[in-house]
């Protein structure tokens, strides 16, 4: 009675192919003959799963990085099969947005390029999609703006698709810096105020970064000694009647408003004294 190790040991994948990340994979350890009988099986990589009592291994929720597996059928000796590649297919991984240009902060009018990177994908054939607020913008790995505008600011994501699924980057905030614009002078309680009351002029603007310095001017283009967003006239006098405008400044530049006219009229008391 000649004793010998198990012969022609093979690791067989029972699943239909391809195997996808998250699948349950069943493998069997087959052999041709053995003397004495096979009493146990071993699986590599060792310690990755509990050793099954039978020559069948079930891998629950298989990972994208599970590469090769080998089994051994053992009697007094162990015979190892050649490793089999699971070849697990998975959606693209580690998708991220990278700004290619400009290298520094983005100013209105700049040419801007964003790149969609990912670390790996199987299968390798992928499609790219760029999205802002749920809307598809482009289908290339790069998203290009010839001349960026403040309206282009916002949250962008890039998506990479393969036949298994799609993966998104984290939201990427595109911030556009621009000089104060859309300046206007608003007047409270209105543009017609009775003398003796108070009038507040507010310099409203749209800017990024926000306006850091305001300058007020009168109808003679004389700068007034006020540098906050609000110009309060109290008590307001008839002599304050006229057109006013404001200028806003931030680190990018300056902007100015059109003229707004304030009319101050006499009170009944003043008219009665005349």
């Amino acid at each position: 009675d000649v004793q010998y190790p198990p012969k022609k040991v093979t690791t067989v994948i029972q699943n239909p192919m391809p195997i996808r990340e998250g699948d349950t994979v069943t493998l069997s350890c087959n052999y041709n003959s053995s003397n004495p009988s096979v009493t146990r099986y071993e699986w590599k990589p060792h310690g990755a799963w509990e050793e099954p009592s039978l020559g069948v291994l079930k891998i629950q929720n298989v990972g994208w990085d599970n590469t090769t597996i080998a089994c051994a059928a053992c009697n007094s000796w162990c015979s190892w099969a050649s490793p089999v590649a699971l070849n697990v297919q998975y959606a693209p991984r580690d998708v991220r947005v990278r700004k290619i240009k400009p290298l520094s902060e983005i100013h209105s009018g700049n040419s801007v390029s964003l790149q969609c990177d990912f670390s790996s994908s199987h299968p390798k054939e992928v499609q790219f999609f760029w999205e802002k607020n749920g809307r598809l913008l482009g289908k290339e790995s790069q998203l290009n703006f010839d001349s960026i505008s403040p309206e282009d600011a916002g949250s962008y994501s890039c998506w990479v698709n393969n036949s298994i699924g799609q993966t998104a980057s984290k939201a990427w905030t595109l911030e556009v810096l621009y000089a104060p614009r859309r300046l206007r002078v608003s007047m409270s309680p209105g543009d017609q105020v009775m003398e003796g009351k108070s009038a507040t002029l507010t310099c409203e603007s749209d800017a990024n970064p926000p306006v850091s310095h305001y300058t007020w001017f009168d109808w003679n283009n004389q700068s007034l000694p006020y540098h906050s967003q609000k110009l309060r006239l109290e008590p307001v006098k008839v002599q304050h009647s006229g057109a006013y405008w404001c200028q806003g400044t931030n680190s990018v530049g300056k902007g100015r408003s059109p003229l707004s006219t304030l009319t101050v009229y006499y009170s009944p008391e003043t008219i009665g004294r005349r």
């Epitope: 607020n133 809307r135 598809l136 998506w159 698709n161 905030t173």
Partner: antibody, heavy 113, light 107 residues
């Protein structure tokens, strides 16, 4: 006006499957992603997954992988979600949402024997 | 996944008052937080996204602030139609996750 019209309420037996629809109008369907969200009775919202209406590419919350399948039919501007192997845990209202800005009215699913 | 803790879960207030609702995330989400209003018989309404951007058509009495992990929704001068359920949601990464909700009721 953007509108997402979802299919009506359903009562199904445990173990069965259900396929609900979300018909979009008022915008170019393939220009936007479609999300699906679950709301169990008296509970908060859970994101199920998202589908690219142009490519059909999908991404799922790990919790709903194997439970939900998202598809689109561009010709009818309709998104679909199929739920399989239903249990009482799947009883909920399911919403489709274009990004975050427009939501359907919800489809109520009741699983009961 | 990003966890979100929303507080309070219940709030009673009177018309004209100003209220705040808070959301805290388990990790930094930059400024990518949205706020919704939910009312029976109506579709969910997006109020604010990216932390502080007011969605088109939403009254200016709604405002959002915060970045990183702490965010606040403020409703100033409450109107009768503002009494509803409010949810926050992070849109920094998938899977999107939601806060547990705040029920705003009339005192």
């Amino acid at each position: 006006e953007v509108q997402l019209q979802q299919s009506g309420p359903v009562l199904v037996k445990p173990g069965a499957s259900v396929k609900m629809s979300c018909k979009a109008s008022g915008y170019t369907f393939s220009d936007y992603f479609m999300n699906w969200v679950k709301q169990s009775h008296g509970k908060s919202l859970e994101w199920i997954g998202i589908i690219n209406s142009y490519s059909g590419g999908t991404s799922y919350n790990q919790k709903f992988k194997g439970k939900a399948t998202l598809t689109v039919d561009k010709s009818s501007s309709t998104a679909y979600m199929e739920l399989n192997s239903l249990t009482s845990e799947d009883s909920a209202v399911y919403y489709c949402a274009r990004w975050m800005d427009y939501w359907g009215q919800g489809t109520s699913v009741t699983v009961s024997s | 996944d990003v966890q979100i803790t929303q507080s309070p879960s219940y709030l009673a207030a009177s018309p004209g008052e100003t209220i705040t609702i808070n959301c805290r995330t388990s990790e930094s989400i930059s400024k990518h937080l949205a706020w919704y209003q939910e009312k029976p018989g109506k579709t969910n309404k997006l109020l604010i996204y990216s932390g502080s951007t007011l969605q088109s058509g939403i009254p200016s009495r709604f405002s959002g602030s915060g970045s990183g992990t702490d965010f606040t929704l403020t409703i100033s001068s409450l109107e009768p139609e503002d009494f509803a359920m409010y949810y926050c949601q992070q849109h920094n990464e998938y899977p999107w996750t939601f806060g547990g909700g705040t029920k705003l009721e009339i005192k």
